[in-house]
């Protein structure tokens, strides 16, 4: 049966809606649409003739229409008018016409509400409040929203007017929301701008802040008073009945014992009317003067002076603390406390003594901190350090030597050559260097305050031949599975090439082999016994080469599992027994001999001559290697049988 | 009575440039979608462009994409399609046509006006 479907059903305003026709008839010739629920020429929108897919517009076309070849409409820009039922007239070629009808109804796109109010300012628990959704519209419904959460269920709350006023009786500080209205027909919802419910409260009774109620003579009382309340309340102070000011803090300097007393806050809300005080008492104590610190010996001198920091000043009966670098003492038998606290002395002071320092005089309140103290510890110079670490420099580059040595006072420099004096600077710097230049460079670090001088000594070889490299270690005996080895090849060159062999081929890749340092370093991470190689080091540069002398590795492993020879297990009585023990090992190992669990020799090899039947039973050797500090074990049984008793048995040696 | 007449066609060369009317009349073109389709001996029918007044938007095929501008003049009531660049391939009968502002369905009952691209 032909029939038509709106999609949609519901149309907005300015939107488009598809009259779908379905299970139109085969063979047609044409087909026509007509608003309304019956064919009427009058009415006609449009038709549509197969044969030529020619559409014709008819008298109640709008332009707005367009007809599908499958005989469906779609109707463009909907208006109101256009709300009400369609009919289809189908012509089939037999000229046998069907009809069928459809229909949709059309909504306005709804306006965005607002919501008005009877009473913009409601006292707590006093009035009512009535919200109105605003514009009144046709067949909308009109929903709520308070804090974008629907209505909460309360006997407080009260919908009328077909939803579109809700009143708020007997209003509470906690209606104070953001209040909403929402708009809805078939094809539109809207909400408003959220209006926020203003309620006036209050005072509460005020709370007065901090809570402290002692304080020091010599401080600053500074108390402040809130009181929940909408509008903001009025603050007064009054300090034993008498007034003193219209703040909401209260601020006195340098109080002393006659500031004790009686506090008290009122708040007042001009709007509500209503007034509240809440009552605090003070009590103010007199108080020792702040302390400070005293030093017997303000420049100290590392690992040679002691100093003693005193607390001042000196009052009977009052508890000492001390705190370094903000924390407590630590427990150090450097440091020693004198039997009232108030002195504290650092025994041969270090440079990481240098603090801050506090002392502290106890009080019935609280604890009063002196001003932090640094001492001054002059210490050093430590061995300076002279950059960069090259040794070896080719003609015709700049030298140029820093030098550093840790120091307080900052350390002053001398630079010597071959034992003479070149100046006193912190750098050296010798531009454009020959053969000339090689020779032993001493940096000296002095300190002035202390008296004291450290120098290094660097031999600088200025060279276009490389010298013969040579391999320095981190381990000369590392242990199996457990240690790493870093090889370095000397000396540091500038602008060199360095190389590695091992067994005299390069170095295979493996990760447990690493270069670094500009391949400088070569790094074995746990090393095995098959590590103990010869590595040679190779240094090369635009001019020349040159390679090492190998260094061998000597891995120290094992033992492994040790082996007892011969196999034989069975002998006849009367052979002699010859048990020989052998453990891989690096060092060789200390062998040791039990027999049925008894102690027997320290020897690899164990000889019992003309066993007999007592010689049964299991024979232990043990292995210990003292330098990779490891041992093992292994058991063996042995049987001895009467003479001829088992033929085919091991004569024995 | 509702009808739309197109004129303007004519014979241009190619890389030349044509302006199409369509005077409509029995309704407003400012309430509903107009645009154009062209028919080719042997090609399928296309609409080139359209132009919804009451939503201000165009459509372009992608075959006229930058060459081919199309506008309304609501108070004479008329439509416009001014061709640019114009190519041998751009040669139909254009037909001023009412459109979907969203799907591809259109109406037209026009005689049309004929476009020929030729050097």
């Known amino acids: 049966k032909l029939t038509i479907e709106s999609t949609p059903f519901n149309v907005a305003e300015g939107k488009e809606v598809l009259l779908l026709v379905h299970n139109l008839p085969q063979h047609l010739f044409g087909y026509s649409w007509y608003k309304g629920e019956r064919v009427d020429g009058n009415r006609q929108i449009i038709g549509y003739v197969i044969g030529t897919q020619q559409a014709t517009p008819g008298p109640a076309y709008s332009g707005r229409e367009i007809i599908y070849p499958n005989a469906s409409l779609l109707i463009q820009n909907i208006i109101q008018n256009d709300t009400g039922f369609y009919t289809l007239h189908v012509i089939k070629s037999d000229l046998v016409n069907e009809e069928a009808t459809g229909q949709f109804r059309v909504y306005p796109e709804l306006p965005k509400p607002s919501i008005s109010s009877n009473n913009s300012k409601p006292v707590e628990d006093k009035d009512a409040v009535a919200f109105t959704c605003e514009p009144e519209t046709q067949d909308a419904t009109y929903l709520w929203w308070v804090n974008n959460q629907s209505l909460p269920v309360s006997p407080r709350l009260q919908l009328s007017n077909g939803n579109r006023t809700l009143t708020l009786f007997n209003v509470t500080r906690n209606d104070t929301a953001s209040y909403k209205c929402e708009t809805q027909n078939p094809v539109s919802a809207r909400r408003s701008d959220s209006v926020i419910l203003n309620v006036l409260y209050g005072p509460d009774a005020p709370t007065i802040s901090p809570l402290n109620t002692s304080y020091r003579s010599g401080e600053n009382l500074n108390l402040s008073c809130h009181a929940a309340s909408n509008p903001p309340a009025q603050y007064s102070w009054f300090v034993n009945g008498t007034f003193q000011q219209s703040t909401q803090e209260l601020f006195i300097p340098n109080i002393t014992v006659n500031n004790s007393g009686s506090y008290t806050c009122q708040a007042h809300n001009s709007d509500t009317g209503l007034n509240r005080t809440t009552v605090t008492t003070i009590t103010v104590y007199a108080e020792p003067p702040k302390p400070f610190i005293t030093s017997n010996n303000s420049n100290p001198v590392e690992d040679e002076d002691a100093v003693a920091l005193t607390c001042e000043p000196e009052i009977q009966n009052t508890t000492y603390l001390w705190w370094v670098n903000n924390q407590s003492l630590p427990v150090s038998p450097r440091l020693q406390l004198s039997n009232d606290n108030r002195t504290l002395t650092l025994l041969s002071v270090t440079r990481n003594d240098v603090g801050p320092y506090e002392c502290g005089i106890q009080n019935e309140l609280s604890v009063d901190h002196s001003d932090p103290v640094i001492l001054n510890v002059l210490y050093g110079p430590d061995d300076p350090t002279i950059s960069p670490s090259y040794t070896y420099y080719r003609p015709g580059v700049n030298l140029s030597l820093s030098c550093h040595a840790a120091s307080n006072p900052p350390a002053q420099y001398s630079w010597l050559i071959d034992g003479n004096i070149q100046q006193h600077t912190q750098e050296l710097f010798i531009s454009n260097i020959t053969e000339k230049n090689s020779g032993l460079y001493t940096c000296q670090a002095n300190n002035s305050a202390s008296g004291h001088s450290r120098t290094t000594v660097k031999t600088i070889t200025v060279s276009a031949e490389l010298p013969k490299p040579s391999i320095s270690s981190n381990n000369s005996k590392p242990v199996e599975d457990k240690d790493a080895v870093a090889f370095t090849c000397e000396p540091e060159a500038q602008n060199t090439t360095y190389l590695w062999w091992v067994n005299g081929q390069s170095l295979p890749v493996s990760p447990r082999l690493q270069l670094s340092n500009g391949n400088r370093t070569l790094t074995l991470f746990n090393v095995t016994r098959n590590d103990a190689r010869a590595y040679v080091c190779g240094i090369q540069n635009s001019v020349s080469a040159n390679r090492s002398d190998p260094v061998t590795l000597d891995v120290l492993y094992g033992p492994d599992t040790p082996i007892i020879s011969p196999p034989d297990s069975s002998y006849l009585s009367g052979a002699n027994l010859n048990l020989s023990c052998h453990s891989a090992s690096n060092p060789s190992p200390q062998y040791s001999w039990r027999i049925n669990g008894i102690p027997q020799q320290h020897t690899q090899v164990l000889f019992i001559a003309k066993i007999t039947p007592n010689n049964n039973g299991t024979y232990a050797c043990f292995v210990s290697n003292l330098a990779t500090g490891r041992n093992n074990s292994i058991v063996k049984s042995i049987t001895v049988s009467a003479s001829g008793t088992s033929p085919g048995l091991s004569a024995g040696a | 009575e509702v009808q739309l007449v197109e004129s303007g066609g004519g014979l241009v060369q190619p890389g030349g440039s044509l302006r199409l009317s369509c005077a409509a009349s029995?309704?407003?073109?400012?309430?509903?979608?107009i645009g154009w389709v062209r028919r080719a001996p042997g090609k399928e029918e296309e609409l080139v462009a359209g132009?919804?007044?009451?939503?201000?938007?165009?459509r372009y095929a992608d075959s006229v994409k930058g060459r081919f501008t199309i506008s309304a003049d609501t108070s004479k009531n008329t439509a416009y399609l001014q061709m640019n660049s114009l190519r041998a391939e751009d040669t139909a009968v254009y037909y001023c046509a009412i459109v979907s502002q969203s799907r591809s369905v259109y109406n037209y009952w026009g005689q049309g006006t004929t476009v020929t691209v030729s050097s």
């Open positions: 029995g309704f407003n073109i400012k309430d509903t979608c």
């Open positions: 132009i919804c007044e009451y939503t201000g938007s165009t």
